[in-house]
């Protein structure tokens, strides 16, 4: 049978609350050189134990008996420190362990999770979490809203998760953890009620440099909306912004709207340009979330100025006219030019030149018509821009270059009949 155990003192028991400091002690009496004392917790050697070993000889000879005392210090007791503790020594070819001592944790509940501050949209459901542990178990939770208990007694209402169906005012929540030792109260979480995201952002009207937009406000609880903020950003040919992308790729145009009405005119925009817009509304508690980006586009406008540098020269029965693109903004895609010419006593002739910037006219009457003038206007899909001032046809002088151009015969009657909105009458003849 095994030799008698050398242990003459075994570890005691420690039970206390978190943070407690305590010491376990074991004592043995051995003959000869004292062994190193190891500590086990639940059968596992403690490699980084805060232990001290004291050795006292009972005689003058090294081979006499020794008293060995090992002390294990537990600082700031935690759940991971709990378990069964034993001392272990290797003596010769034998292994000895002490009787076990136990370290337990017992005190007020300890929070593993507490409710956190957060923002929620008005009348929108959300959850809060709270988790506590002993020992001793069980730990029962009691939720409080604005310091008012939400159940008749601990453990009777919601426990780890509190489901709140919605709030219409900013509120505070906390939870109490109850066990046999008493009560611990969690931190107080503030739940801030923000306006709901606006809905149905849409265009009311469009102008080349102006968009009128409207939206439906979301609920904001007991807090009236103070204003709404609209952002517009150039769509950059569809690059960069997707429907749900949180931040625009460049600095947006930001406008504030007093509310009501939930409508805003956005000015100073580029014509015929794609934009993305979004809106958020603000109460005294803060702003709602932004709506998704809505793609919109300003329509085309008519050119803002006439063609430039018009020159018109006449050589017998032919007239050569050329010009340059308007310097003023086109407000869209240039589709072409219209030309009108008229003599002193002859009807006005209107022509669509297309995108060319020059034309040679074949005049009737062998050039006998006097005081001939020419006007040119640029047009887009939105209509004609302003006509140029009338330019008189000058006689061609030898030495002037006159390139060969397609001849355009002057019709005996006006060749074109323009739809009313395309024909800008001019008053200079």
């Amino acid at each position: 049978q095994a030799e008698e155990s050398p242990f003459v003192g075994n570890p005691g028991n420690i039970t206390g609350a978190r943070g407690l400091t305590g010491t376990l002690r074991c004592q043995l009496q051995v003959q000869g050189e004292p062994p190193e004392v190891h500590w086990l917790r639940d059968g596992q050697i403690l490699e980084l134990a805060d232990s001290t070993q004291t050795q006292v000889p009972l005689g003058e000879d090294e081979q006499d008996d020794w008293i060995v005392v090992s002390q294990l210090r537990i600082t700031s007791l935690q759940l991971s420190d709990t378990g069964q503790y034993q001392c272990l020594v290797f003596l010769g070819h034998q292994t000895f362990v002490s009787q076990p001592g136990y370290v337990g944790l017992e005190g007020l509940p300890y929070f593993l999770e507490e409710p956190e501050d957060r923002t929620v949209a008005a009348n929108t459901p959300f959850n809060l979490s709270c988790q506590a542990q002993g020992p001793p178990e069980p730990v029962d939770l009691l939720w409080l809203q604005d310091a008012v208990p939400l159940a008749t007694a601990p453990g009777h209402g919601p426990q780890r998760s509190l489901h709140v169906p919605g709030l219409n005012k900013t509120s505070s929540f906390s939870c109490e953890a109850h066990n046999a030792k008493g009560v611990t109260t969690s931190r107080t979480a503030t739940i801030t009620v923000l306006p709901q995201q606006p809905r149905n952002l849409h265009l009311v009207s469009r102008q080349p440099t102006e968009l009128e937009v409207a939206w439906t406000p979301g609920l904001s609880g007991i807090y009236p909306l103070t204003h709404c903020t609209l952002q517009a950003v150039l769509s950059d040919d569809g690059m960069g912004i997707q429907a749900g992308e949180p931040d625009p790729p460049e600095e947006p145009l930001t406008s504030q709207a007093s509310v009501p009405p939930h409508q805003l005119r956005l000015g100073s925009l580029h014509p015929h340009t794609p934009y993305h817009i979004r809106v958020a509304c603000t109460s005294s508690q803060g702003p709602s979330s932004w709506t998704h980006w809505l793609p919109v586009e300003t329509p085309e406008g008519v050119p803002l100025g006439p063609p430039e540098n018009i020159s018109a020269t006449r050589n017998g029965s032919q007239a050569f006219v050329h010009w340059q693109e308007p310097r003023a903004p086109l407000q869209g895609t240039l589709l072409g030019y219209r030309l009108a010419y008229q003599g002193q006593d002859t009807p006005e002739v209107l022509m669509d030149i297309g995108l060319r910037q020059e034309v040679t006219l074949e005049l009737q009457g062998d050039g006998s018509v006097s005081n001939l003038t020419v006007c040119v206007a640029a047009y887009t899909a939105a209509g004609d821009g302003p006509w140029s001032l009338p330019v008189p046809l000058e006689a061609w002088r030898p030495g002037q270059a006159q390139p060969v151009h397609q001849l355009v015969k002057e019709p005996s009657t006006p060749a074109f009949s323009w739809p009313h909105h395309h024909h800008h009458h001019h008053h200079h003849h």
Partner: antibody
């Protein structure tokens, strides 16, 4: 001297349970942990859990939780390992081993074969 | 859990040679333990607390190491040392073993 003597080989059908015994001698049975370690054919060693005979406290490897039960009968210095819901991959040699922070003494092993 | 990786998996050695088996841990540990298992036998404790010889183990066996790298050394190998050697840690739960190193005598 320290000795751990295990029960004999077992053949079981899938879904059945097996209970292996380990009789200890040569040391104070209630002072030392008894561990169970298994070794599948041609494989390495896998710890299953321990029991402290002095208190009956147990600790299990998560892999086996719910299927393994460790017990002792201190009156006859015997530890038991029961494994339920056996599968073919539970075929292995099962060892009991005394521990003092490591496994200082081992039983001779019990072969458990699971086959339909 | 801590994974222990032994090297080599297999070694064929002649008697009187010096053999070194290494064991690498996936995270730092305080102590390493070594076991010897001969064919059709149960494992036997060889080294405990990294460098201490278990009862009855010949002095040609020794252990060393710290942190993540540990070594078992057999000086002047003998025929009876043909076996599979396992390293083991219990610095954290669960205790785990290396995959084993099989030593064959030429």
């Amino acid at each position: 001297q320290v000795q751990l003597v295990q029960s004999g080989a077992e053949v079981k059908k899938p879904g059945a349970s097996v209970k292996v015994s380990c009789k200890a001698s040569g040391y104070p049975f209630t002072d030392f942990y008894i561990n169970w370690v298994r070794q599948a054919p041609g494989q390495g060693l896998e710890w299953m859990g321990w029991i402290y005979p002095g208190s009956g406290n147990t600790k299990y490897n998560e892999k086996f939780k719910g299927r393994v039960t460790l017990t002792v009968d201190t009156s006859i210095s015997t530890a038991y390992m029961e494994l339920s819901r056996l599968r073919s991959d539970d075929t292995a040699v099962y060892y009991c081993a005394r521990s003092t922070g490591f496994f200082d003494y081992w039983g001779q092993g019990t072969l458990v074969t699971v086959s339909s | 859990q801590i994974v222990l990786t032994q090297s080599p998996d297999f070694q064929s050695v002649t008697p009187k040679e010096k053999v070194t088996i290494t064991c690498s841990a996936s995270s730092s540990i305080g102590y390493m333990y070594w076991y010897q298992q001969k064919p059709d036998q149960s494992p036997k404790s060889l080294i405990y607390l990294t460098s201490n010889l278990a009862s009855g183990v010949p002095s040609r066996f020794s252990g060393s190491g710290s942190g993540t790298d540990y070594t078992l050394t057999i000086n002047s190998l003998e025929a009876e040392d043909a076996a599979t050697y396992y390293c083991q840690q219990w610095s954290s739960n669960p205790p785990t073993f290396g995959q084993g190193t099989k030593l064959e005598i030429k």
